[in-house]
């Protein structure tokens, strides 16, 4: 699986989740956040050819397309597969609101 | 929605489904399929701007992330969202054989 | 500019519900919340609750969380508050609104939407 | 719910003079973080509210000096070291310190 501990152990140069971390300040302008500052969100990264972890029946005969295209602009594209929530503190009046937002970590990635 | 109703009768420039015509034999070495002899697979391409069809929190999240850190290679990525099968026939010895491939054609795309 | 759209009048008959949009524009919409507070004449102004486009994070006041709903579309730029159940204690302008956070100042409003509620 | 007075209700001045409007809060407004998240609004007829002073004395972005807020705990003031013709109109206390948050009654400042 190119999961984060595959992919951070090694100099994959194919699509894997990479290391990313959002300042919610900074990167999104989210000021009312209170905990935490910010967050390894990571991303997906690299090329997709023929047989690497493609995700459906498309993607595999998009690979192969493209194999025997190599100048052709479809191609499948490394994204997201297992994205994890984030625990948030912010408040609203004087009362801290603990949030489990979803989807927020990418865990790993699939050619799709 | 990013669908071939609406992509193939717009100019859109960012992401949507394309046209695309693969033909078994010269595109992928199939010489097994008897009909069709190729399908319109299509592929999505475009950019993944901020709030164009955003499929989860995170990719909101990096979208904005991207407006705010324009140089980045972090970036959502088009990929396909609703994918139909294609019937094929093919031979088994002297008996034709017809068969449903699962998700071989892109109806539309989404930024993931 | 920040603009913050709504339409201007809505008749409903009471016991029915109705839906609002407020349109943003001229800013980055999933960076900030919209507020909804409503303004009856001679009662003053009354918050209603907040959304965070970016998150779908809500809060209420109590006293609207049976009869106020707040949802978002991030792809039109667009908030909605729906009311149910409606009365003739609920004919009020209803403004949406930007603010940074829960806690921040509202810096921007709608130009509000008149809910008549008659039969 | 915390209460906001405001007095007077209405402010009869001549153009040129200071007005100094009251907003008087029933449980302090400080906040465990060390914020006073009182703020002041003016609202003209036909018009929505405008921001005038966010957090006790912060001047909102195009706001001409002659505007100022002060206070503390419970007690606050807006001033207007020279009133204009078109400072006219409704002015509003409110806070978000506590839920729910609540606005005052208003403060008509009209010509004498």
């Known amino acids: 699986a190119l999961d984060t501990n595959y992919c951070f152990s090694s100099t994959e140069k194919n699509c894997c989740v990479r290391q990313l971390y959002i300042d919610f300040r900074k990167d999104l302008g989210w000021k009312w956040i209170h905990e935490p500052k910010g967050y390894h969100a990571n991303f997906c990264l690299g090329p997709c050819p023929y047989i690497w972890s493609l995700d459906t029946q498309y993607s595999k005969v998009l690979a192969l397309y493209n194999q025997h295209n190599p100048g052709a602009s479809a191609a499948p594209c490394c994204v997201p597969q297992a994205l994890e929530p984030l625990p948030i503190v912010y408040y609203v009046g004087r009362k801290p609101k603990v949030e489990q937002l979803s989807n927020m970590i990418v865990r790993s990635c699939k050619c799709s | 929605a990013l669908d071939t109703n609406y992509c193939f009768s717009s100019t859109e420039k960012n992401c949507c489904v394309r046209q695309l015509y693969i033909d078994f034999r010269k595109d992928l070495g199939w010489k097994w399929i008897h009909e069709p002899k190729g399908y319109h697979a299509n592929f999505c391409l475009g950019p993944c701007p901020y709030i164009w069809s955003l499929d989860t929190q995170y990719s909101k999240v990096l979208a904005l992330y991207n407006q705010h850190n324009p140089g980045a290679s972090a970036a959502p990525c088009c990929v396909p969202q609703a994918l139909e099968p294609l019937p094929i026939v093919y031979y088994v010895g002297r008996k034709p054989k017809v068969e449903q491939l699962s998700n071989m054609i892109v109806r539309s795309c989404k930024c993931s | 500019q920040v603009q913050l759209q709504q339409p201007g009048a809505e008749l409903v008959k009471p016991g029915a519900s109705v839906k609002m949009s407020c349109k943003a524009s001229?800013?980055?919409?999933?960076?900030?919340?919209i507020t909804w507070v409503k303004q009856r004449p001679g009662q003053g102004l009354e918050w209603i609750g907040d959304?965070?486009?970016?998150?779908?994070?809500?809060n209420y006041n109590e006293k609207f969380k049976t009869k106020a709903s707040l949802t978002v579309d991030t792809s039109s730029s667009t908030a909605n508050m729906q009311l149910s159940s409606l009365t003739s204690e609920d004919s009020a302008v209803y403004s949406c609104?930007?603010?940074?956070?829960?806690?921040?100042?509202?810096?921007?409003w709608g130009q509000g939407t008149s809910v008549t509620v008659s039969s | 719910d915390v209460v906001m007075t405001q007095t007077p209700l209405s402010l009869p001045v001549s153009l040129g003079d200071q007005a100094s409007i009251s907003c008087r809060s029933s449980?302090?407004?400080?906040?465990?973080?060390?914020?006073?998240?009182l703020h002041w609004y003016l609202q003209k007829p036909g018009q929505s509210p405008k921001l005038l002073i966010y957090?006790?004395?912060n001047r909102f972005s195009g706001v001409p000096d002659r505007f100022s807020g002060s206070g503390s705990g419970t007690d606050f003031t807006l001033k207007i070291s020279r009133v204009e013709a078109e400072d006219l109109g409704v002015y509003f206390c409110?806070?978000?310190?506590?839920?729910?948050?609540?606005f005052g009654s208003g403060t008509k400042l009209e010509i004498k």
């Open positions: 609104a930007r603010k940074l956070g829960p806690n921040y100042a509202v810096d921007y």
């Open positions: 001229g800013y980055i919409f999933t960076s900030y919340w």
């Open positions: 959304i965070f486009p970016g998150t779908g994070s809500t």
């Open positions: 449980q302090s407004l400080i906040h465990s973080h060390g914020n006073t998240y």
């Open positions: 957090k006790l004395s």
């Open positions: 409110s806070q978000s310190t506590h839920v729910p948050f609540t």
